[in-house]
């Protein structure tokens, strides 16, 4: 599956919400619905 | 205002195929993911995927096995589903579905009116 | 995959009186203090309709009667005052980690 970024400092990743320490910078794409910040 | 209109009930063989159209209209298509949902007859509500409309990725439910794929057509503001292999367990009422992100000011939820699929012999 | 469970299957309330839905995650569905449960409301015929998001959150234009509670993996949804619009399915779902994943729905019919 791929990989979605998000602005609040998790990612989606292999299907689960994995926190992560960079900031994620750009949110360009469209909203996933139902996260933070989750676009892809 | 924002409308997701699907295509109408189909009725399919096991084995065969289906493509379920969602059209969007009342918003820029590219700024929302589209989901789909479905619902057997009696029965709860199972998430089978979702594809952005803006970049063309989807994510989908490993329950459906490489079945299902979820495409769109930006010219049209439209999103498909197609469901492969069918056996009876798909016969459902398939939808298309919007969300926001809940950390807006506002959290809606927009539902296409749904597509009955029925799968028999 | 995270599984969901409801309890009741269903239950009858008078006019009036309060209904309380029980949803169970079975693992929990908070990240970074926010829990990712929401709940529908489906009336036959029809899409399901948010009511609830992030456990305690109002959709837009829900009335106030419907309100949640919960974190981890155990959420409530209680409607204060059942009104006969109100007889409809209710489903928790989590949107934590994909597959996103329903509970079986509890069918809720007036006493």
């Known amino acids: 599956d791929a990989e979605f970024r998000h602005d609040s400092g998790y990612e989606v990743h292999h299907q689960k919400l994995v926190f992560f320490a960079e900031d994620v910078g750009s949110n360009k794409g469209a909203i996933i619905g139902l996260m933070v910040g989750g676009v892809v | 205002q924002v409308q997701l209109v699907q295509s109408g009930a189909e009725v399919k063989k096991p084995g065969a195929s289906v493509k379920v159209s969602c059209k969007a209209s009342g918003y820029t298509f590219t700024t929302y993911a589209i989901h789909w949902v479905r619902q057997a007859p009696g029965q709860g509500l199972e998430w089978m995927g979702f594809?952005?409309?803006?970049?063309?990725?989807?994510n989908y439910n490993q329950k459906f096995k490489g079945r299902v794929t979820m495409t769109r057509d930006t010219s049209t503001s439209t999103v498909y589903m197609e469901l492969s292999s069918l056996r009876s367990e798909d016969t459902a009422v398939y939808y298309c579905?919007?969300?926001?992100?809940?950390?807006?000011?506002?959290?809606?939820?927009?539902w296409g009116q749904g597509t009955l699929v029925t799968v028999s012999s | 995959d995270i599984v969901m469970t409801q309890s009741p299957d269903s239950l009858a309330v008078s006019l009036g009186e309060r209904a309380t839905i029980n949803c169970r995650a079975s693992?929990?569905?908070?990240?970074?203090?926010?829990?990712?449960l929401n709940w529908y409301q489906q009336k036959p015929g029809q899409p399901p309709k948010l009511l609830i998001y992030?456990?305690?959150k109002q959709g837009t234009g829900v009335p106030d009667r419907f309100s949640g509670s919960g974190s981890g993996t155990d959420f409530t949804l209680t409607i204060s005052s059942l009104q006969a619009e109100d007889v409809a399915v209710y489903y928790c779902q989590q949107s934590k980690e994909f597959p996103w994943s329903f509970g079986g729905g509890t069918k809720v019919e007036i006493k």
């Open positions: 693992e929990s569905v908070d990240n970074d203090r926010i829990s990712f």
């Open positions: 579905a919007r969300f926001d992100n809940i950390d807006r000011g506002y959290v809606r939820d927009y």
């Open positions: 594809t952005s409309p803006y970049s063309g990725v989807s």
């Open positions: 992030a456990a305690t």
